[in-house]
Structure formats: C-alpha cells, structure tokens
C-alpha cells in the first residue's frame, strides 16, 4: 500500500529533523510515468544512504520497513520492463530535504495513476 510508504516517509522526515546529514542523493525530480518504476528503484537505493549516514536505529527500521512495503507494492504491479530511462547515477544530486520532497512526489504519482 503506497499510503503506508508515504506514512514512513513522514516518519523519516520527522526523525531526521534534529540531525545534520549533509549527504547528497541521486534524485529524479521530473519522473516520466513510463519510467516511474525505474525511478522508484533509484529512490529506494538512495534511501539506504540516509539510513547509513544517520546511524539511527529508528531511521534504519523505518527505512527497512519502507523498502519492504515499496517492493511489495511494485511487485503487485507485475514485472514491468521500462526502457530508455535514466540510470541512478545520471540523476541530479540533491540534499536530503529535496530528495524526500521528490520521493513523496513519485509515491504520489503511483497513487494517483493507479
């Protein structure tokens, strides 16, 4: 359920507010609907950087749960093959605040277009 993914993103944003994490993360800020699964996989990979950088058990657990929920939601869509999409490393690097903002945006796209 993508709304549960949103809920975990809200928890992560609440948890990182008191931390200083200056990592930059590969961020897709203009997702084409035909590349949304590829983009989501990049977001999930980069989310693990936040988990590692924070060194916080609550963030680690929430990230872990979010990844499971997102992968379950992706697999329920069936095996989608997307072509011509950007590799994660080709994406723009952004700060955590902008990364999370774009992450919410792509999850909302999955909800809105389902």
């Amino acid at each position: 359920n993508w709304v549960n993914v949103i809920s975990d993103l809200k928890k992560i944003e609440d948890l990182i507010q008191s931390m200083h994490i200056d990592a930059t993360l590969y961020t897709e800020s203009d997702v084409h609907p035909s590349c949304k699964v590829t983009a989501m996989k990049c977001f999930l990979l980069e989310l693990q950087v936040i988990s590692l950088e924070s060194g916080d058990a609550s963030i680690h657990d929430t990230v872990e749960n979010l990844i499971i929920l997102a992968n379950n939601s992706l697999s329920s869509n069936g095996n989608v093959t997307e072509s011509g999409c950007k590799e994660c490393e080709e994406l723009e690097e952004k700060n955590i605040k902008e990364f999370l903002q774009s992450f919410v945006h792509i999850v909302q796209m999955f909800i809105n277009t389902s």
Epitope: W2, V3, N4, I6, S7, K10, E13, D14, Q17, S29, D30, V31, H32, P33, L100, Q101, S102, V104, H105, Q108, M109, I111, N112, T113, S114
Partner: antibody
Amino acid sequence: QVQLQESGPGLVKPSGTLSLTCAVSGGSISSSNWWSWVRQPPGKGLEWIGEIYHYGYTNYNPSLKSRVTISVDKSKNQFSLKLSSVTAADTAVYYCAREGIGWPSFDYWGQGTLVTVSS
Amino acid sequence: SSELTQDPAASVALGQTVRITCQGDTLRSYYASWYQQKPGQAPILVIYGKNNRPSGIPDRFSGSSSGNTASLTITGAQAEDEADYYCNSRDSSGKNLVFGGGTKLTVL
C-alpha cells in the same frame, strides 16, 4: 513568478454545463506539478474538484466525479474544467491552482471567478 | 462530512499567540498545508510540509504535527492576520485532496 487566470461564463443555466479555462503564465503546464480546480460557494469553505497531470492523468472528487471532466492543452499552456448538469448548489467562486511538489499543497492560485447557476 | 476537522472560530489578542488545529486520521500519513484567506481574495499558502513557509510569509507563522493533528501557530498576532484559515491534505486513500472546514480568526 507563476500566474494563473480563470476565464469563462459567469452565468450558467440549470441543467447546463459549466466550462472554465485556466491560463498558466510564467511557467510550463508540462512541469512536474499537478494542476487543480477548487471551488468555494458564497460564505462557505473550500472544496477540491479535481486535478490533472500534463500526461493526461486525472483524479476527481468522488462526490463530483460523475459530472466533472478536466483536460489539458499543452500547446496553449492551459487546462480546463467542465461540470455538467449544474444546479444552484454549483454556484461558487471557482479557482484554478498549481499543486506543490511533494507534500499536499497549492502554491499558486488564480484570483477566482464567480459562476452563478440561474435561469 | 470532511475528513479534516477544524474549529469554526478562534480569537486572539493583538500581539498574543494563537494555535489553530486540524484533525483527521489521514494526518498520520500526510502533512497538512495551511492557507490564509481574506474576504474577496484567493487563498494564500502560509505553511506546507513539516514546517515550511513560502517566501514572503512572516516567520510568526509556523506549523507542527502530532498524531492525527496538525497545528498552525501565529506567534505575536497582528491585525492583518484576521482571516479565515484552512488546512488541506489528502484523504485516507491518498488519491483525493481535502480541505478542513476553515477557522475564522478574529484579532482583538
């Protein structure tokens, strides 16, 4: 600075169709944003009507879904609202608005246009 | 009935602090945004996300969230803050946008 401007008839007859257009300037309708219509009956609160993404995806308020159509014209940088089978209860100020990226918000609004349903 | 509930009215003495609240189960998953609307004018976004202010919005406006409640706080209310305030978020399905019923703020 993004600007939105609603246009369309200010008076619609009962059982007719309300048609409005929102012209977007200072930004592209093909951006990552979703675009919405919101209305406000006289002396009452705000009600979301529906939203559109430039690829053509739409979502509508369940209470209005059977009567609403929102469309986009990328060549004119505008989007439109059609509301069919109108009654006096549809009399309201109609706003178009741009949704922010990420958490729910409307970061830019048109000035609004009053549409009265009356014979 | 709205998925977001606001008190219809609130008042504050000039220069004092007021908190306007918005309740709904969906706020456990989504942040709310807040709008100020004065008579005859379009709404203006004052707070979005966790506690973000668009440029031009005074820092006396702040937002917070706990459980199923979102709050808008005005610290040191000014006469020009007298207006209707609306919260906004998504519904429980995540698909639809919803508004609270609005709170009419009077500055005494």
